[in-house]
């Protein structure tokens, strides 16, 4: 029930924690499962047990195998198993899948990459970071405590990140590397009932007869990429294309904008050479998505020409 996979590279330090928990005061006995041989606690040994931790300083390929830990509490003993695999160092840059820790995802607002397993080691800064084997340089990358922060994350930042640090044990230093994949995702989006920003409900728009007029229908639908969201104009409850007045046209395509991070759409209605009969029409701005439809109505009124007195 309590088995945990651990892996490392030959000639690096590897520290494994017993999968069964216990208080620091509880004795933990470690055994090499295949031989049932007890792991020594003396630190002079290359492989030794230290409470809940099993230390390989450094690890060798021959150390691979299953190790048993027994936590001896005042009530019952509790047993865990550590399945340890030590691999030979790769000569090329590629990190094979079996050496990869869990993938983490980041976004523009949250781009922390934690160095896996580092909390088990006695390390001191600096922590070195590499992406696809290249040392990370530049002001966008900041190594902070046990994690890497990337400023202004872009999709190109996705890849395999390796942290490298030094473990110190009784004055001796051992190298440790750990690699994990980083993926870049869009910020979590959401959709909501359309909110029409313009025009206002029952707005009266002043126009000049004989001049051109533009009406803008603008609505927001949520955050992130939206599916099945649209804005459009209707004349007297009829689609513009079906109304049959060539002077009145919707602007081709819908302009997408992001206002305060919200996904919004605009549709402009263009009226050429405004006529008296246009003032009698009802102009409806419609915004619709999966949540439903919202309608704001606009009417046109004649703009009185300004009298110029001498």
């Amino acid at each position: 029930k309590f088995s945990k996979q651990s892996w490392g590279l030959e000639n690096e330090a590897l520290i494994v924690r017993c999968p069964r928990q216990g208080k620091p005061s509880y004795t933990v006995d470690w055994y090499y499962s295949q031989t049932n041989k007890s792991i020594p606690t003396q630190e002079r040994n290359r492989v030794f047990a230290s409470g809940q931790l099993l230390k390989f300083l450094p690890a060798a390929v021959a150390d691979s195998g299953i190790y048993t830990c027994i936590v001896r509490s005042p009530t019952f003993n509790r047993t865990g198993y550590a399945n340890v695999t030590i691999y030979k160092k790769q000569s090329d840059c590629n990190v094979p899948d079996y050496l990869m820790y869990s993938t983490v995802s980041g976004s523009e607002k949250n781009s922390k990459i934690y160095c896996p397993t580092i909390d088990l080691y006695n390390w001191t800064a600096p922590l070195e970071w590499f992406k696809n084997c290249q040392a990370l340089q530049g002001s966008r990358y900041r190594a902070h405590k046990s994690f890497l922060v990337i400023d202004n994350v872009m999709t190109e930042d996705a890849g395999d990140y390796t942290c490298k640090f030094i473990h110190n044990e009784n004055g001796a230093n051992y190298s440790v590397t750990a690699t994990r994949s980083f993926t870049v995702k869009d910020e979590q989006g959401f959709s909501l009932f359309p909110v029409i920003g313009a025009p206002a409900q029952n707005e009266i728009k002043e126009v000049e007869i004989g001049k051109n007029a533009n009406l803008t229908c603008s609505a927001c639908f949520g955050k992130g990429t939206q599916f099945l969201a649209a804005v459009l104009w209707q004349l007297n409850g009829t689609k513009i294309t079906d109304f049959g007045e060539p002077r009145i046209q919707q602007e081709e395509g819908q302009n997408q904008s992001f206002s305060n991070g919200l996904a919004c759409l605009d549709m402009v209605l263009r009226i050429a050479d405004v006529k008296e009969e246009d003032l009698l029409l009802q102009y409806d701005c419609l915004a619709l998505n999966l949540h439903g439809l919202r309608r704001h109505t606009v009417r046109l009124s004649r703009k009185n020409p300004i009298d110029h007195h001498s």
Partner: antibody, heavy 121, light 107 residues
Framework: EVQLVQSGAEVKKPGESLKISCKGS????????IGWVRQMPGKGLEWMGI????????RFSPSFQGQVTISADKSITTAYLQWSSLKASDTAMYYC??????????????WGQGTTVTVSS | DIQMTQSPSSLSASVGDRVTITCQAS??????LNWYQQKPGKAPKLLIY???NLETGVPSRFSGSGSGTDFTFTISSLQPEDIATYYC?????????FGGGTKVEIK
């Protein structure tokens, strides 16, 4: 199938003695601690004590120490809970439960169906 | 003895609701805490051991968390068959002790 089967309901008078049983099957009886839990009418669960049938090692809750005896017969894979002199306050449901091995433990994972003990004059 | 304080003592929730029960130990018990379900007239049944591990065969809507002195048991989406009393139990020290129980009913 791993199971614990308890003896049937008992009705006794105050001062009488009683021994109830719990038979284990489907697992290595001597390798697991087995214990007893009391539940008085309408109340919660109270841990009484355990025995390791492999060597008859026992542990008791101070509340039940000296009040009851826990024993086991590994030849017939059965654990026992007994009273030498029952009291009305012993009226309860008694459950036996398996408590893990000498080297591993993860809760009271197998329970008997319970034995109702009624003590009334 | 380690005292285990469970709350609430009873609750009523609708089918599909998220239900949370807390258990507090009078001293540090690491993660040595189990959760049991007892249906009326039945023996208790182990649901969660070592604070957060789901016992084999137990539906994934049940979960547990916590360490030290504060623990939480959650039913993510209450089902009619979850009507029962739930108990926490520590096994860090003898005597093993149970919480007082939480009776869960359907509204």
């Amino acid at each position: 199938e791993v199971q614990l089967v308890q003896s049937g309901a008992e009705v006794k008078k105050p001062g009488e003695s009683l021994k109830i049983s719990c038979k284990g099957s489907g697992y290595s009886f001597t390798n697991y601690w087995i214990g007893w839990v009391r539940q008085m009418p309408g109340k919660g669960l109270e841990w009484m004590g355990i025995i390791y049938p492999g060597n008859s090692d026992t542990r008791f809750s101070p509340s039940f120490q000296g009040q009851v005896t826990i024993s086991a017969d590994k030849s017939i894979t059965t654990a026992y809970l007994q009273w030498s002199s029952l009291k009305a306050s012993d009226t309860a449901m008694y459950y036996c439960a398996r408590h893990g091995t000498s080297s591993d433990y993860y809760g009271l994972d197998v329970w008997g169906q319970g034995t109702t003990v009624t003590v009334s004059s | 003895d380690i005292q285990m304080t469970q709350s609430p003592s009873s609750l009523s929730a609708s089918v599909g609701d998220r239900v949370t029960i807390t258990c507090q130990a009078s001293q540090d018990i690491s993660n040595y805490l189990n959760w049991y379900q007892q249906k009326p007239g039945k023996a208790p049944k182990l649901l969660i051991y070592d604070a957060s591990n789901l016992e084999t065969g137990v539906p994934s809507r049940f979960s547990g968390s916590g360490s030290g002195t504060d623990f939480t048991f959650t039913i993510s989406s209450l089902q009619p068959e979850d009507i029962a009393t739930y108990y926490c139990q520590q096994d860090d020290n003898f005597p093993l002790t149970f919480g007082g129980g939480t009776k869960v009913e359907i509204k």
